[in-house]
Amino acid sequence: EPPTACREKQYLINSQCCSLCQPGQKLVSDCTEFTETECLPCDSGEFSAQWNREIRCHQHKYCDPNLGLRVQQKGTSETDTICTCEEGWHCTSEACESCVLHRSCSPGFGVKQIATGVSDTICEPCPVGFFSNVSSAFEKCHPWTSCETKDLVVQQAGTNKTDVVCGPQDRLR
């Protein structure tokens, strides 16, 4: 009986099992019982990542600088190009098809995790005892100044956006 299923790295066509083309190649013609599957290497700028029977390889991804993209890893005949974003930008999706500017943390918030090429800035509210008075993509919450260590006293309490104001201790007259 003709086969109804084939081994791994084979495919069924015309009642027979043909070898798939290996990664980095594309199908030219199916096998016959007299000749093996005919495959050819992918052209420059193309790739195939899996064992396949595709008649065309896939185009390498283009990292468009107009979208803030640059090449992180050059594609091969078996792998796609990997794009990342220019400094100060991050990918809008896992596929990294476009970039957006890193978010800045507003006053009252500090940077918990600095942005990378693939993830945005993560901000956190400054807890009691800490403040941030700038909008920044890098600055963490800073601790309030310790007036005591300077032999000073708190003249104005700090907030999540402002530092404490220290002043001299009142002298006993």
Epitope: S15, Q16, F34, T35
Partner: antibody
């Protein structure tokens, strides 16, 4: 025991026709691809034609395409090669062979075809 | 069609010799190559398939190697019955094609 026995060869004039037969025994004929290979006197081997198993496709060398036709009768366990418009350069011993995994593992003893006026 | 070129076309050797026959394809055929032996007045016999696999019943002194475009058939220690003509045959592209043959003669 696998056996392949060719017949039908002989002397024929240029432009003439001939039909070769290959009687198979000792194996399940319908399950195997079969082919014809020829060898001109004192020369090397030339693959002429092949036919797939299970009523599979037919394939030909460019030198015989359009002139030769391969066929099989699984009920008679017989392979055929119909040769038309024969030329002097078709003179050769014609072998039928059984195919397995892209190799010809059993061959007949051959039948001589002579094309001459 | 893929051209198969064997070398040498003929060679003389003695019993016990180690002999190597080469076959070159005009384009890459991966490991899709067979070797046959033919004695005068007889049909060819399959020796090696898929470049390096020994056909059942063939003595282990025969071996094959190579891939891409360059292949070799080696007989490790020639026996009297090994004097014959050897052919390579590719099955990487349609139609299958043979080399022109290498005639192995007694020195």
């Amino acid at each position: 025991e696998v056996q392949l026995l060719e017949s039908g060869g002989g002397l024929v004039q240029p432009g003439g026709s001939l039909r070769l037969s290959c009687a198979a025994s000792g194996f399940t004929f319908s399950s195997y691809a079969m082919s014809w290979v020829r060898q001109a006197p004192g020369k090397g081997l030339e693959w002429v034609s092949g036919i797939g198993s299970y009523g599979g496709g037919t394939y030909y060398a460019d030198s015989v395409k359009g002139r030769f036709t391969i066929s099989r009768d699984n009920s008679k366990n017989t392979l055929y090669l119909q040769m038309n418009s024969l030329r002097a350069e078709d003179t050769a011993v014609y072998y039928c062979a059984r195919y397995v995994n892209f190799g010809m593992d059993y061959w007949g003893q051959g039948t001589l075809v002579t094309v001459s006026s | 069609d893929i051209q198969m070129t064997q070398s040498p076309s003929s060679l003389s050797a003695s019993v016990g010799d180690r002999v190597t026959i080469t076959c070159r394809a005009s384009q890459s055929i991966s490991s899709y190559l067979n070797w046959y032996q033919q004695k005068p007045g007889k049909a060819p016999k399959l020796l090696i398939y898929a470049a390096s696999s020994l056909q059942s019943g063939v003595p282990s002194r025969f071996s094959g190697s190579g891939s891409g475009t360059d292949f070799t058939l080696t007989i490790s220690s020639l026996q009297p019955e090994d004097f014959a003509t050897y052919y390579c045959q590719q099955y990487g592209r349609n139609p299958p094609t043979f080399g022109q043959g290498t005639k192995l003669e007694i020195k």
